[in-house]
């Protein structure tokens, strides 16, 4: 009598995640009576995938009608393949018994699953940095198979070269993850800049996935301060302005100090944006010179984005301006926040 053969013609089968996989198996004889079972893996820890004899295998269907006696085809189709289904599948013939006795196994078919990488997620530094500093951006993508993958970094369309990439795990796995860290040197012009992480994989058919991060989340552009005095007005008032320019983000608090005492505090809001994404702000004070005997030291103090305050001072020379009669008395208040020094911003 001819020896029973269990034939698995394909050594390997590759399937895209979500598709169905067909695993082929034929036997040379239906003798002796007994079931065919499919397992993933070999040895004592093997996993039962399909048993014609019994059990509920909702994702597995026989390719041919197993109830036809002359059917020697015990191929199966597994639906909705995921990376977790990867492995080597064995078609095994048993002889009926208690327990069933394993007679012969096929050589095995390795199922590999082509799984798309997840959309790359780019994350930037936890705290903002200023121009000329180097910041790190991390790009992560998961769940892809096979392991081969290409990752590139771009800043405003220009490819970056200073990055380090790891694909895990190093050994064989059902699916893989990639993590890449790019180092980017910031400039004052980077508020509108963007970094792009681009992932190319065999499953993407030449249409890479991209993840982006805006440098606006990572950069701080500290302001320039300039305090100037406008010419003396006819009513003995001097207009002093504090120009705060080219800063980002908008979060900024400006305090006027008169001889070291807080005169007024303002918060920047709803400022128009410069072309480069930075902001400008001008605040002004009106100083009634005739109300002062001595020179007035005005300080414009700016606290930007939680950083230590930056000061710019200016002295208004009272001696340079002739006093009017009765000018040594306090000037009448003409509005809130006005204590002989009048202010505004714009």
């Amino acid at each position: 009598e001819e020896e029973l053969q269990v034939i698995q013609p394909e050594k390997s089968v590759s399937v895209a995640a979500g598709d169905s996989a067909t695993l082929n198996c034929t036997v040379s004889s239906l003798i002796p009576v007994g079931p065919i079972q499919w397992f993933r893996g070999a040895g004592p820890g093997r996993e039962l995938i399909y048993n014609l004899k019994e059990g509920h295998f909702p994702r597995v269907t026989p390719v041919s009608d197993p109830t036809k006696r002359n059917n020697m085809d015990f191929s199966i189709r597994i639906s909705n393949i995921t990376p977790a289904d990867a492995g080597t599948y064995y078609c095994v013939k048993f002889r009926k018994g208690s327990p069933d006795v394993e007679l012969k196994s096929g050589a095995g078919t390795e199922l590999s699953v082509r799984a798309k990488p997840s959309a790359p997620v780019v994350s930037g530094p936890a705290v903002r940095a200023t121009a000329e500093h180097t910041v790190s951006f991390t790009c992560e993508s998961h769940g892809f198979s096979p392991r081969d993958i290409t990752l590139k970094w771009f800043k405003n369309g220009n490819e970056l070269s200073d990055f380090q990439t790891n694909v895990d795990p190093a050994g064989k796995s059902v699916s893989y993850s990639i993590r890449s860290t790019a180092r980017v040197v910031l400039t004052r012009r980077d508020v509108h800049s963007q970094v792009i992480c681009e992932v190319a994989h065999v499953t993407l058919q030449g249409d890479p996935l991209r993840g982006t991060a805006n440098l606006s989340e990572a950069i701080r552009v500290p302001p320039f301060l300039e305090v100037t005095q406008q010419s003396m007005r006819a009513d003995n008032q001097v207009n002093v302005t504090c120009q705060v320019t080219k800063f980002y983000p908008q979060r900024l608090q400006l305090t006027w100090l008169e001889n070291g005492n807080v005169s007024r505090t303002e918060m920047a809001s709803a400022l128009p944006e410069n072309k480069d994404g930075t902001y400008n702000w001008t605040s002004w004070l009106l100083v009634n010179v005739s109300a002062h005997r001595d020179d007035v030291k005005l300080t414009c103090q700016v606290e930007h984005d939680g950083q230590p305050a930056v000061n710019k001072s200016f002295s208004v020379k009272v001696s340079a301006h002739p006093k009017e009669q009765g000018s040594n008395t306090a000037a009448e208040n003409t509005g809130t926040n006005e204590r002989n020094i009048y202010g505004g911003s714009g």
Epitope: I31, V33, G34, K53, E54, R69, N70, S98
Partner: antibody, heavy 118, light 107 residues
Framework: EVQLVESGGGLVQPGGSLRLSCAAS????????MHWVRQAPGKGLEWVSA???????YYTGSVKGRFTISRENAKNSLYLQMNSLRADDTAVYYC????????????WGQGTMVTVSS | DIQMTQSPSSLSASVGDRVTITCRAS??????LAWFQQKPGKAPKSLIY???SLHSGVPSKFSGSGSGTDFTLTISSLQPEDFATYYC?????????FGQGTKLEIK
């Protein structure tokens, strides 16, 4: 339609012989394990004999040496040659098809009555 | 030979009842157990194979369970046509053997 039709039953004297036939239609008989099962009047079912696809034959102890199971592929038929019949062989004899891979009975004939009596 | 013992031998029940018949093998038969239904003057009908698999065309009110030596047949809601004699059978090894039968009668 898959069908099994038995014939050849009847009245026979103890020690006599009878040949039962089972004509199969709707499937190829040689591709299946085939069986004979009997039921004495008012009693339960008793498996009698089987023939495998390779021609291997099996019998219950009480009929060994007296009964012979065979098949004729050209006629798609199964037979049971019964010799040295005894009164306790009196029964309805059913031809039964065994299932594909585990030999579970799936198709039964309508049966033929064998009466062994003097 | 493997002995098959059914219980009860007879059972009275009403239409709509749920009934369970048990079958015990004298040794481990894996799950190579079948159940048959027979009505008077008729050939047996195959209901269940490998302990729990329904033959095609058999209504789902019939269910089987068990493995090793202890098995059950359950009919979930009896109908008039279900009153018959039920047999279990082991087919793990020759000689195949049947239980003595359980006669299900209308109460």
């Amino acid at each position: 339609e898959v069908q099994l039709v038995e014939s050849g039953g009847g009245l026979v004297q103890p020690g006599g012989s009878l040949r039962l036939s089972c004509a199969a239609s709707g499937f190829t008989l040689s591709s299946y394990d085939m069986h004979w099962v009997r039921q004495a009047p008012g009693k339960g079912l008793e498996w009698v004999s089987a023939i495998g696809t390779a021609g291997d034959t099996y019998y219950t102890g009480s009929v060994k040496g007296r009964f012979t199971i065979s098949r004729e592929n050209a006629k798609n038929s199964l037979y049971l040659q019964m010799n040295s019949l005894r009164a306790d062989d009196t029964a309805v004899y059913y031809c039964v098809r065994g299932g594909v891979w585990d030999d579970a009975f799936d198709i039964w004939g309508q049966g033929t009555m064998v009466t062994v009596s003097s | 030979d493997i002995q098959m013992t059914q219980s009860p031998s007879s059972l009275s029940a009403s239409v709509g009842d749920r009934v369970t018949i048990t079958c015990r093998a004298s040794q481990d038969i894996n799950n190579y157990l079948a159940w048959f239904q027979q009505k008077p003057g008729k050939a047996p009908k195959s209901l269940i194979y490998t302990a729990s698999s329904l033959h095609s065309g058999v209504p789902s009110k019939f269910s089987g369970s068990g493995s090793g030596t202890d098995f059950t047949l359950t009919i979930s809601s009896l109908q008039p046509e279900d009153f018959a004699t039920y047999y279990c059978q082991q087919y793990v090894s020759y000689p195949y053997t049947f239980g003595q039968g359980t006669k299900l009668e209308i109460k």
